[in-house]
Amino acid sequence: RQQWELQGDRRCQSQLERANLRPCEQHLMQKIQRDEDSYGRDPYSPSQDPYSPSPYDRRGAGSSQHQERCCNELNEFENNQRCMCEALQQIMENQSDRLQGRQQEQQFKRELRNLPQQCGLRAPQRCDLEVESGGRDRY
């Protein structure tokens, strides 16, 4: 069993290294920013210039393209629930520094949890997404 675990670890690590999770991050960031545009932002607030370019393209077409690419990447983890969990944790970790405030973090986490389902994949069971911004130790 020990040997199998080690091989499993290595296989997962190399899968994660090969995977491009950036489209997933972009898709999720666009989603929560669209939600903020629709519900959360005060229309009279001068805090953001509506003409300033966003780091994430907010057009729906761009988002669905990101989602498709994201789902293709996540599909690689379908048969390894632990590795799927690690992929989601990595997405959370990569974005945690960019999320502004607790509310945005919770929103991102909620969307991230729904991601496998959106892609028609099984969500990993017992997967802890409470990742600290300090990063996690790799095994």
Partner: antibody, heavy 123, light 110 residues
């Protein structure tokens, strides 16, 4: 008030069988995972088996897989543990517990415990 | 030998603060939620902390939980003589498809 009451503990010879029962009350039994946990005399806690709400999924400790069977009767709110080919290593207090595991992004936790029932395997 | 490692014993005076560590690996604590239990002599265990940091109702805020990487910690502040007990951590292990318990820590309040 949540109550879990185990029964069926006994002194049994090595190689023998035993069936433990756990009568649950005070909560909607069919909506919770349930778990058996045991404790050998003077030792720590050891998880034995989990069963999903509808009984469709079961997980076992390696050393009991193939010998023990966890099952449930949601209509009666009763959890069972059928134990076969018992050995001295199976001796201990067996606890019936309610498991708070709900969805993919939550963990196993045991928020209610029975009083425990003693199983002794000895010749 | 338990896969989750806890110190076998720890002692402190009333009013002090103690922490109990629980270390595992990526396949258990690293990926999954941790819970903590208190077992007083000759009684069934009681849930203190679940999902790493959450306290069930009825558990005083003297008890806290945290997790970092593949280790978890239980903190107890304002120690009382009634806290003298065994403390166990637990989590799911994705490779073994099993719940693991730590070996337990006996807390003595001097």
């Amino acid at each position: 008030e949540v109550q879990l009451v185990e029964s069926g503990g006994a002194l049994v010879q090595p190689g023998g069988s035993l069936r433990l029962s756990c009568a649950a009350s005070g909560f909607k039994f069919s909506t919770f995972y349930m778990t058996w946990i045991r404790q050998a005399p003077g030792k720590g806690l050891e998880w034995v088996a989990n069963i999903k709400q509808d009984g469709s999924e079961k997980d076992y400790l390696d050393s009991v897989r193939g010998r023990f069977n966890i099952s449930r009767d949601n209509a009666k709110s009763v959890l069972y543990l059928q134990m076969n080919t018992l050995s001295a290593d199976d001796t201990g207090v067996y606890y019936c517990t309610r498991n708070g595991l709900q969805d993919s992004y939550s963990g196993d936790f045991f928020d209610h415990w029975g009083q425990g029932i003693l199983v002794t395997v000895s010749s | 030998q338990s896969v989750l490692t806890q110190p076998p014993s720890i002692s402190a005076a009333p009013g002090q603060k103690v922490t109990i560590s629980c270390s595992g690996t990526g396949s258990n604590i690293g990926h999954n939620y941790v819970s903590w239990y208190q077992q007083l002599p000759r009684t069934a265990p009681r849930l203190l902390i679940f999902d790493n940091t959450k306290r069930p109702s009825g558990i005083p805020d003297r008890f806290s939980g945290s997790k970092s990487g593949s280790s978890a910690t239980l903190g107890i502040t304002g120690l009382q003589t009634g806290d003298e007990a065994h403390y166990f951590c637990a989590t799911w292990d994705a490779d073994l498809s099993a719940v693991l318990f730590g070996g337990g820590t006996k807390l003595t309040v001097l």
